[in-house]
Structure formats: structure tokens, C-alpha cells
Interface confidence: medium
């Protein structure tokens, strides 16, 4: 049984009757094929469900799809397939839902081989009505909305053309040919790479990076010899081929590609890769692959310009380009990230950082837990978390770690307790303090989700047998109640709740199997009557994030400030509600050396907070490439960590002298860059 399933747990009164009155079944009149579900807008209650069924015939594949719509969070569905003229929708493109609450939806249809172009169905009223539009091209990718204006769409065609629409897909214009990759930037800017000779693959490393800020009226070449590019936070990154050999380096721009600087990162060879693990407006986490087929690399964290990098974590597990990494941003607490390292003996271990990559440690062993067979010392071991890599290896791990920004401090994950990740069946663990301490929450693998900003946690056992029981907790996973939501068990396929964890509705998806047919079925449970009343002031308590030593005046200081949160008490059974806003009170900390990273040419010896000169650069003038010029750096070795808000205390001074010499960079310098207009 789950921890807490005993007489000592406070039971939620009459919950069976309350949930039974709020459990809604919907059987879909479909043969079981595939099903995809999308939420349209925020707090609208609108869900679109697309079911598709393929019948492989001898010469061709016959397909059928149906579209359903709910406007009450999944309690009831209406078949709206006739709104899209009973057309077969291509599932590989999914449902393209517009940003924010635009209410826009684009569905891409399957068309017959000889047609001039593709076909889309467009809705701008939360899928109440659809307009059919025939395209002048066959789409290669899903339609991409501009984050700033949902009327602006871009798509790549199967002929590698870049197509743009300014009126939400009604009219399309090809703005460029021979395009490999295109992305929206800020302010409706489009960045894209083009090939000159044969194809995207043949020209890899010889691509050009272009920018248009006016939807294709004019263009600017902002880079050459490009391998690939990426956007993260306010940074634009490009990996650029070196002149002399087959290596490439990362260049970074913070002004949309007008000026570039070479990132102080190792170059990589043909078989290696760079990967932006996470980025915000302050900094970036960059993974640099090791040479050879090692399956690991190094994480570097950037300064505020994205130029100077500090080594953050060695032997970081990342299998191949586009492969698996366990790197996870714990969104429920600032500065916290979890990932896996590959140790010398090829075992995989979990590491956590609480200060945005400054220091990494093992996860603390949960109280009242035993070390498993992987542990050399039965009393000393750590918690190891299963994430993407374990899932890719087909371990019995149904879900990756879960955290939500509005469920402060809560992290839920599958894990094992030992010296490394175990291949044995995992249990589910929870942290209520952003990863500092952990408790076993459920025995064995489960699906889980957070509702009402943490007021309810819902879980379903991962089983190959049909299920009919859901578990829920109103006290952050300490005590669990079980509810039988149907008499007839179903083959479970997934839990669905509205993104953002503010909803009190959960949908359980699965299928029933009878002798002749199988059908999709969903059960939507509304927990509103379990949380009968709205939370009041007395239901919240104050919690200091990152607290490790109450005696220390600087307790809770991370990146130069501490934050006190109002958190729901575990014993309060009440609704945070859809409008719940996290209440936090920040206070600035005094600066210490911990608030500074080591500048270019400096490093921190292990277990030391002081930055010392790199021996090979001692006594040399420090020269590095900045905005296409060589800079002379006069520094005492420190630079403020991006996003750090500390004031007073220690204050190392630094200055940069400009030598105004050209860098030997193979990147286009600004004055060489060309522009052209259509």
C-alpha cells in the first residue's frame, strides 16, 4: 500500500459520494487507433480530441479521423468532424494551437497524391467553426505561430520553401527558397538557414543564416559557414565551421545577429554536438559533447553576455545529437536543476544544483528508506531520479519528473535509493522543498499530476492490467485515498489535465476491449467538492526557500536574494482556486564571492570560492573576441553571476580595455554583411 494509507491519515469526509457525483464518462464512437488531445486557450475548458484509425490495405493505407470538442474540461464531448468536412487529419502535424488565448487552431489535412498543395482547416473561435483553405504548397512542418502576433504563420514546404501568412493562413506567400530551418524570434523576426548548392544535408556547415524583420520584404545575411542555429532567452546562437578543419564553434549574438562574439567554449568535431539545455534572459546552460561515442559531455554556464562560460558539470549524460538527457528544470523553485552523470564505472547517478549550476550535489537520501543493492555502504547512499534516459531505455518508468511553477517547492519523480540508478522497479518520491529533502510517496511506478496549484496530487498505478482506481492526496503526498471511478476496468493510456496545474479536473484516458471491438473512453473527475471551501489566510504558512541553516543570517540566499513564500498547509483541505497567485516576499542579500563567477582566464579550484588565474595564461595579456574585435581584458577575475541581485558586501571591480583589433574569426563581421530587398 502507499505510504499514508492507514488509520493515522486524516480521511477526506464522504469523498466517494462527492467524486461519484463529479465523475463523467465519455465513450468515443471510434475503433481504437491513435488519439491526440489539445487544450485550446487558458481557463476556457475547451479540449479538442483527434482520433485516427489506419487500415493498411494492399496497395494503400486507408485512414479515418474524427474530431471531438469539449467546452467543460472534458466532461462532455461533441463530435464536430462535420466541421472539417469529415476530412482525414494528418496526426504527425498534430493540432497547431495558437499562443496565449487567441483561440486559434490549425489542422493539416491528408490530401491525395496528385494535388497541387496541402489543405488546412482554420478556426479562430476556439474550434466552434472551421474554414477550409487549400495551400499553394505541401507542408513539411506544422504551422508555426509568431509569439507576438497569432495572425502571422510560417511553414516550410516539402520543396524547402519558406512560406509566410499574414492573415492566419488565408493567403500564403513564399518568401525564400532553399530553406533548411526557420524559427520565429522576437518582434515578428524570422531567422532561417539556406543552402546554396545541393541540399540542407549536403551543405551542412556551409549554410547561410538569414534574418527578415518585415515578414519577407527585406533580408539580411547575418552569418555564413553555418552548421545550425538556436534561440534561447535573449541569445541567438550559431555553430560555425572553422576555416582550417572540420571543427565548429559557437558564436553568440544578443542583438538579433547584427554583431557576434565567439563563445569561450571548446570547439567540436564532426561527430560531436552542442546543445542548449536551458536558457533565459540572464544566462544559458550549454552542453558540449565529448569526442568519441562516450554518451556524455560537459555542462557550461554562461555569463550575462553568453560569451564567458564556467564549467558547471563533468560527465553529463547525453547520448547523441537529439538523443536523451535527463536535464530537468525544476520549475517549482528558482535556481534548481536536476540531471544525470555517467560515472567512471558506467553507472548513472543523479545530481542536483540549487544555485543555477554553480555547485552540483547528490540528492539527499529520503528518510526511512533503505539503500538498495547498488550501494556499497548500506547506510550511506543517495536518491537517483529516473527521467528521459530511463524512459528511452524502456525501464518501468511511465513519467518524467514533474514540477509546476505555481505549486511551490513540489517535485515528484520516480527514483531508487542507492549509489546509482537501479534497473529494478522504481518507487515515486516527492520533495516539498524544491529537491533538498525527499520522501517516498508511492510504492511502485505511477502516473501522477498536480491539480489546484498543489492542493491535490492525483496518481494512477502503472500496470499492464486494466485499472479502475485512482489515488489522490490533499496533503502533498503524505496520505492517499483511493477512488474506484468505474466498475469496468479500462486499459489505461494517459492522464490529462489542463496545463498550468490550476484546474481541479483530471481526465483518465483508456480503451475498453471486448470480443469484437475496442473503443476509446475517458473519465473526467472534478475534485471541486473534495476541496469544499476557498482557502483563507489561516490556511497558508510562511516558508523560506533554500533554507539550510536557520542560524546563518544569509540562510536562503541564492543568486543574491532570498524569498519567503506563502504556502498551503498540508492539513488544509481547501481550494487555492484558478486565480491563485504565488505570494512571495524577496529580500536582497549581501554579496559574497559566491555571487561572482570566474571571468575569462580564471577558474575556481575545488572547494574554494576564490577565482585564480589559469596557469597557462598567468602573466599574459588576456585577449578575447568580442563583437568582432579583439579585446584586452583587465580583471581581478570575477564577474557577477547572471540574475544575481546581491548588494553591498564583497565587490570585486573589473574593467575592459578595447584594443580595437580585428578578431581572427571566420564569421562575417558587421561591415561585410549584405542586405537585400524583395
Amino acid at each position: 500500500s502507499a505510504p499514508g494509507e492507514d488509520e493515522e491519515c486524516g480521511r477526506v469526509r464522504d469523498f466517494v459520494a462527492k467524486l461519484a457525483n463529479n465523475t463523467h464518462q465519455h465513450v468515443f464512437d471510434d475503433l481504437r487507433g491513435s488519439v491526440s488531445l489539445s487544450w485550446v486557450g487558458d481557463s476556457t475548458g475547451v479540449i479538442l480530441v483527434l482520433t485516427t484509425f489506419h487500415v493498411p490495405l494492399v496497395i494503400m493505407t486507408f485512414g479515418q479521423s474524427k474530431l471531438y470538442r469539449s467546452e467543460d474540461y472534458g466532461k462532455n464531448f461533441k463530435d464536430i468532424t462535420d466541421l472539417i468536412n469529415n476530412t482525414f487529419i494528418r496526426t504527425e502535424f498534430g493540432m497547431a494551437i495558437g499562443p496565449e488565448n487567441s483561440g486559434k487552431v490549425v489542422l493539416t489535412a491528408e490530401v491525395s497524391g496528385g494535388s497541387r498543395g496541402g489543405r488546412i482547416f482554420r478556426s479562430s473561435d476556439f474550434a466552434k467553426n472551421f474554414v477550409q483553405t487549400d495551400l499553394p504548397f505541401h507542408p513539411l512542418t506544422q504551422m508555426m505561430y509568431s509569439p507576438q502576433n497569432s495572425d502571422y504563420l510560417l511553414a516550410l514546404s516539402t520543396e524547402n520553401g519558406l512560406w509566410v501568412s499574414k492573415n492566419f493562413g488565408g493567403k500564403w506567400e513564399e518568401i525564400h527558397k532553399a530553406v533548411c530551418l526557420a524559427k520565429w524570434g522576437s518582434d515578428n523576426t524570422i531567422f532561417f538557414t539556406t543552402y546554396a548548392n545541393g541540399s540542407c544535408k549536403a551543405d551542412l556547415g556551409a549554410l547561410e543564416l538569414w534574418r527578415t524583420s518585415d515578414l519577407g520584404k527585406s533580408f539580411k545575411t547575418i552569418g555564413v559557414k553555418i552548421y545550425s542555429f538556436g534561440l534561447g532567452g535573449r541569445f541567438l546562437f550559431a555553430s560555425v565551421m572553422a576555416d582550417k578543419d572540420t571543427t565548429r564553434r559557437i558564436h553568440v549574438s544578443t542583438d538579433q545577429g547584427d554583431t557576434w562574439s565567439m563563445a569561450q567554449l571548446p570547439s567540436v568535431g564532426q561527430e560531436q554536438f552542442y546543445s542548449i539545455l536551458a536558457a533565459n534572459d540572464d544566462m544559458v546552460f550549454m552542453h558540449v559533447d565529448e569526442p568519441g561515442d562516450t554518451g556524455f559531455g560537459t555542462i557550461f554556464t554562461s555569463d550575462d553576455r553568453g560569451i564567458v562560460y564556467s564549467k558547471s558539470l563533468d560527465r553529463h549524460l547525453y547520448t547523441t545529437t537529439g538523443g536523451e538527457t535527463d536535464f530537468t528544470n525544476v520549475t517549482s523553485l528558482r535556481g534548481v536543476y536536476i540531471t544525470s552523470v555517467l560515472s567512471e564505472d558506467n553507472s548513472i547517478q543523479t545530481m542536483i544544483t540549487f544555485d543555477q549550476g554553480g555547485r552540483w550535489t547528490h540528492l539527499r537520501k529520503p528518510e526511512n528508506s533503505e539503500c538498495d543493492a547498488t550501494a556499497k555502504n548500506k547506510n550511506e547512499c543517495s536518491l537517483h531520479i529516473h527521467a528521459s534516459y530511463s524512459i528511452s531505455q524502456k525501464l518501468n518508468v511511465p513519467m518524467a519528473p514533474l514540477s509546476e511553477p505555481n505549486a511551490v517547492g513540489i517535485v515528484i519523480a520516480h527514483g531508487s535509493v542507492g549509489d546509482a540508478i537501479s534497473v529494478m522497479v522504481p518507487d515515486v518520491y516527492i520533495s516539498d522543498d524544491g529537491g533538498y529533502s525527499w520522501t517516498k510517496m508511492l510504492e511502485g511506478p505511477h502516473y501522477y499530476t498536480i491539480l489546484d496549484s498543489g492542493g491535490i496530487i492525483v496518481a494512477i498505478e502503472h500496470s499492464s492490467r486494466p485499472i479502475n482506481v485512482i489515488k489522490f492526496s490533499t496533503d502533498e503526498g503524505q496520505c492517499w485515498q483511493t477512488y474506484t471511478f468505474t466498475r469496468d476496468p479500462i486499459y489505461f493510456t494517459g492522464l490529462a489535465s489542463e496545463p498550468g496545474a490550476r484546474s481541479m479536473n483530471i481526465s483518465i484516458w483508456g480503451f475498453t476491449e471486448s470480443f469484437l471491438t475496442s473503443q476509446w473512453v475517458s473519465y473526467t473527475i472534478d475534485f471541486k467538492d473534495i476541496l469544499e471551501r476557498n482557502c483563507e489566510e489561516k490556511d497558508y504558512t510562511i516558508w523560506l526557500a533554500h533554507s539550510t541553516d536557520p542560524e546563518d543570517y544569509e540562510d536562503g540566499c541564492i543568486l543574491g536574494y532570498k524569498e519567503q513564500f506563502l504556502r498551503l498547509r498540508k492539513s488544509s483541505v481547501c481550494q487555492n482556486g484558478r486565480d491563485y497567485v504565488v505570494t512571495k516576499q524577496p529580500s536582497i542579500c549581501l554579496c559574497s564571492l559566491e555571487d561572482f563567477l570566474c571571468d575569462f582566464g580564471y577558474y575556481r579550484p575545488e572547494n574554494d570560492s576564490k577565482c585564480v588565474e589559469q596557469p597557462e595564461l598567468k602573466g599574459h595579456d588576456l585577449e578575447f573576441c568580442l563583437y568582432g574585435r579583439e579585446e584586452h581584458l583587465t580583471t581581478n577575475g570575477y564577474r557577477k553571476i547572471p540574475g544575481d541581485k546581491c548588494q553591498g558586501g564583497v565587490n570585486p571591480v573589473r574593467e575592459v580595455k578595447d584594443l580595437k583589433k580585428k578578431c581572427t574569426s571566420n564569421f562575417l563581421s558587421p561591415e561585410k554583411q549584405n542586405s537585400k530587398s524583395n
Epitope: 486524516g10 533538498y436 496533503d475 504558512t541 516558508w543 536557520p550
Partner: antibody, heavy 124, light 107 residues
Framework: QVQLVQSGAEVKKPGASVKVSCKAS????????MHWVRQAPGQGLEWMGW????????RYAQKFQGRVTMTRDTSISTAYMELSRLRSDDTAVYYC?????????????????WGQGTTVTVSS | DIQMTQSPSSLSASVGDRVTITCRAS??????LNWYQQKPGKAPKLLIY???SLQSGVPSRFSGSGSGTDFTLTISSLQPEDFATYYC?????????FGGGTKVEIK
């Protein structure tokens, strides 16, 4: 060592106010809540409220709302509790007590250090 | 407000006896329960916090258990210095409330 030293005994007339001080030493004053608890002669313990010395935020028991004011002076690590419109049934020993903390949580772990108590007598 | 009911209100015991005091909350308080000892003319002293954690410096003969609504303080072998009044206190929901106390006297 960690200690809380309270001001001396007070005798007050009904309708008057009393202000009790509690000086903390041996620990970081702003890092712990300060609770105030009273005990009438021969009776049990009654919680009055707390103050967060770091922010100055307070929470009072409903019974004392409007009559009690808790303040602090971080420069001298001292907390104060003022009770106004005194009645004879306010005669009690008044204690300040430090709230125990654990992993960031300010409440829920009891009161681990107590002052020696201040006797307040309300009599006409 | 959450009512805390302690029983018994008083008990007589001898040195070496095993003593059990119970405390019941009017609604679930998870494990936010603390136990105090108070001797005449002195301030209370924290013995057990979070239902079962022993406060540092408190002898191991004191132990606490329970969760939800029912809690127990146990003194495994009563010592002469243990004769005092014991209070339970919930710190889960404002206002914080105390039990009425249990006076442990010499038989």
C-alpha cells in the same frame, strides 16, 4: 548560549496598556519567529500571536485582535508585545518563545526557547 | 479553532512506571503536534516536536507518536524529575492551541 530575557513584573489598572520586552541573544534574531503565550494563575497555556522579526509580519489570535500589538527592534534583537485596554482577566504570566524552524518552515515545529516570563497584574 | 483534548487531566505514578498521555485534535493536524513539560514557577520546555521528533537535550525515555487526530506522549520509565504538567500543542492551523494539560504526580 541561546536565551530570551524578558522585562520585569508589571502592575496595571484596568483600561491601561502594558508593553513587555523580550531580548534575544546567542542566535540570529531575525531568523526565527517570536511567539507570545500567556498563562493565567492555575490555568493552561494560551497563544496570543507571533511576529516574524525579519519582515515585521504578525499574526494574532482572534481573541486578542485589536488589543495586541507585536513589534520588534532588530538593531537590539528585541521583540515587544503591547496589550491595551487591560481587564482583570488579563492577569497572567506572559512568555515570549522562539519558534523552532526546520527546512525553511517557520511554523509547525513548536517553541524551543522560552523567556523566564513576565507577571502582569491587572487590579484596580 | 482546533480544540486539543488531553487525557487524563491528572495521574499518579511511581518512579520507574511507564506513563502514557494522550492528546486528541478536533480535526486532522497531520504531524504538527508538539509536547511540553512545565514545572511550577518555570517556563514550559519543548520535549517533542512534529509528533515524534525528540528535541535535542531531552532524555530518550520521552517519545511521541501519532498523526492526524490522535497522539501519544510516552515516558518509558518515570524519573523523579519528570513530575510536572505536560501540554500538547498543535501548530498546524492558526490560532495555535494547547491542550488543557496533564499533571503527573507522585503516587
Amino acid at each position: 548560549q541561546v536565551q530570551l530575557v524578558q522585562s520585569g513584573a508589571e502592575v496595571k489598572k484596568p483600561g491601561a496598556s502594558v508593553k513587555v520586552s523580550c531580548k534575544a541573544s546567542g542566535y540570529t534574531f531575525v531568523a526565527y519567529y517570536m511567539h507570545w503565550v500567556r498563562q493565567a494563575p492555575g490555568q493552561g497555556l494560551e497563544w496570543m500571536g507571533w511576529i516574524n522579526p525579519n519582515s515585521g509580519a504578525t499574526r494574532y489570535a482572534q481573541k486578542f485582535q485589536g488589543r495586541v500589538t507585536m513589534t520588534r527592534d532588530t538593531s537590539i534583537s528585541t521583540a515587544y508585545m503591547e496589550l491595551s485596554r487591560l481587564r482583570s482577566d488579563d492577569t497572567a504570566v506572559y512568555y515570549c518563545a522562539r519558534g523552532k524552524r526546520s527546512s525553511g518552515w517557520y511554523e509547525g515545529y513548536g517553541m524551543d526557547v522560552w523567556g523566564q516570563g513576565t507577571t502582569v497584574t491587572v487590579s484596580s | 479553532d482546533i480544540q486539543m483534548t488531553q487525557s487524563p487531566s491528572s495521574l499518579s505514578a511511581s518512579v520507574g512506571d511507564r506513563v502514557t498521555i494522550t492528546c486528541r485534535a478536533s480535526q486532522s493536524i497531520s504531524s504538527y503536534l508538539n509536547w511540553y513539560q512545565q514545572k511550577p514557577g518555570k517556563a514550559p520546555k519543548l520535549l517533542i516536536y512534529a509528533a515524534s521528533s525528540l528535541q535535542s537535550g531531552v532524555p530518550s525515555r520521552f517519545s511521541g507518536s501519532g498523526s492526524g487526530t490522535d497522539f501519544t506522549l510516552t515516558i518509558s520509565s518515570l524519573q523523579p524529575e519528570d513530575f510536572a504538567t505536560y501540554y500538547c500543542q498543535q501548530s498546524d492551523v492558526s490560532p495555535i492551541t494547547f491542550g488543557g494539560g496533564t499533571k503527573v504526580e507522585i503516587k
